[in-house]
Interface confidence: low
């Protein structure tokens, strides 16, 4: 599995590097942190444990998607 | 087609060093884990370790103190030292493709290393 | 370690008839992300082993689709629908889920 890999980015296009997700059962992972009146950070990769999720703080916004097709 | 080329000496003495070495032809040499596995004479499989591009390795606890396993990335190469042997590490060595987590779906053709005084 | 146990040890098979090996981890095998981590070899006699599934139940390429592998958690089976002469072998069952990484003991097939 092929997935785009970064960490704490502000932009997509920052987001471009290509990680082989070479363990079974792995998906690409995407993280969305946005602080309140900052941009929003943007980590992806693989991941073992990838599991969907979203959850407002008073501060921000914390949101988590998962899949598993190359590049997605 | 990936192939793994293994090779190294075939005999030893007791308290030697095992020295072998793999070399990786075709896909991706950095995109995965690389072991090395070993099996006794008419006996099963044993899993010595693992190592990645980078380096990173993993060993069975059970030869942890005496197992080297190194990279040469330039050389798609992997290497394996087993310090002070002894007849019980008598075996067929197999370099393989694959690690925790992982199947090994490439293997090497396999070394006898016999220990004898 | 997670200690993994086959049955039988020696399997004699008529060609055309099915057969089956038993392979048991002394821990769970599945993972919270819903795979097993179980893969099953054949070692030919004079050769390496080759890959014949992993993930429990997935075949490897080029494996004939008369070999099938079932099971989760603790309890797993290999299936040869129908036994041909190239099956003969050792056949090992192992787990990439914990290090160090094992092997069940092996299981010989051989033809009557």
């Known amino acids: 599995l092929l997935c785009y890999s970064c960490k704490a980015q502000v932009s997509n296009e920052d987001c471009l590097q290509v990680e082989n997700c070479t363990q079974l059962g792995e998906q690409c992972w995407t993280a969305r942190i946005r602080a309140v009146g900052l941009l929003t950070v943007i980590s992806k990769g693989c991941s073992l444990n990838c599991v969907d999720d979203s959850q407002d703080y008073y501060v921000g916004k914390k949101n988590i998607t998962c899949c598993d097709t190359d590049l997605c | 087609q990936v192939q793994l080329q293994q090779w190294g000496a075939g005999l030893l003495k007791p308290s030697e060093t095992l020295s072998l070495t793999c070399a990786v032809y075709?896909?991706?040499?950095?995109?995965?884990?690389w072991s090395w596995i070993r099996q006794p004479p008419g006996k099963g499989l044993e899993w010595i370790g693992e190592?990645?591009?980078?380096?990173?390795?993993n060993y069975n606890p059970s030869l942890k103190s005496r197992v080297t396993i190194s990279v040469d990335t330039s050389k798609n190469q992997f290497s394996l030292k087993l310090s002070s042997v002894t007849a019980a590490d008598t075996a067929v060595y197999y370099c393989?493709?694959?690690?925790?987590?992982?199947?090994?779906?490439?293997w090497g053709q396999g070394t006898l290393v016999t220990v004898s005084s | 370690d997670i200690v993994m146990t086959q049955s039988p040890l020696s399997l004699p098979v008529t060609p055309g008839e099915p057969a089956s090996i038993s392979c048991r981890s002394s821990q769970s095998l599945l993972h919270s992300n819903g795979y097993n981590y179980l893969v099953w070899y054949l070692q030919k006699p004079g050769q390496s082993p080759q890959l014949l599934i992993y993930l429990g139940s997935i075949r490897a390429s080029g494996v004939p689709d008369r070999f099938s592998g079932s099971g989760s958690g603790t309890d797993f089976t290999l299936k040869i629908s129908r036994v041909e002469a190239e099956d003969v072998g050792v056949y090992y069952c192992m787990q990439p889920l914990q290090t160090p990484i094992t092997f069940g003991q092996g299981t010989r097939l051989e033809i009557k």
């Open positions: 075709g896909g991706s040499f950095s995109g995965n884990y």
């Open positions: 190592i990645n591009h980078s380096g990173s390795t």
């Open positions: 393989a493709r694959g690690g925790s987590y992982n199947y090994f779906d490439y």
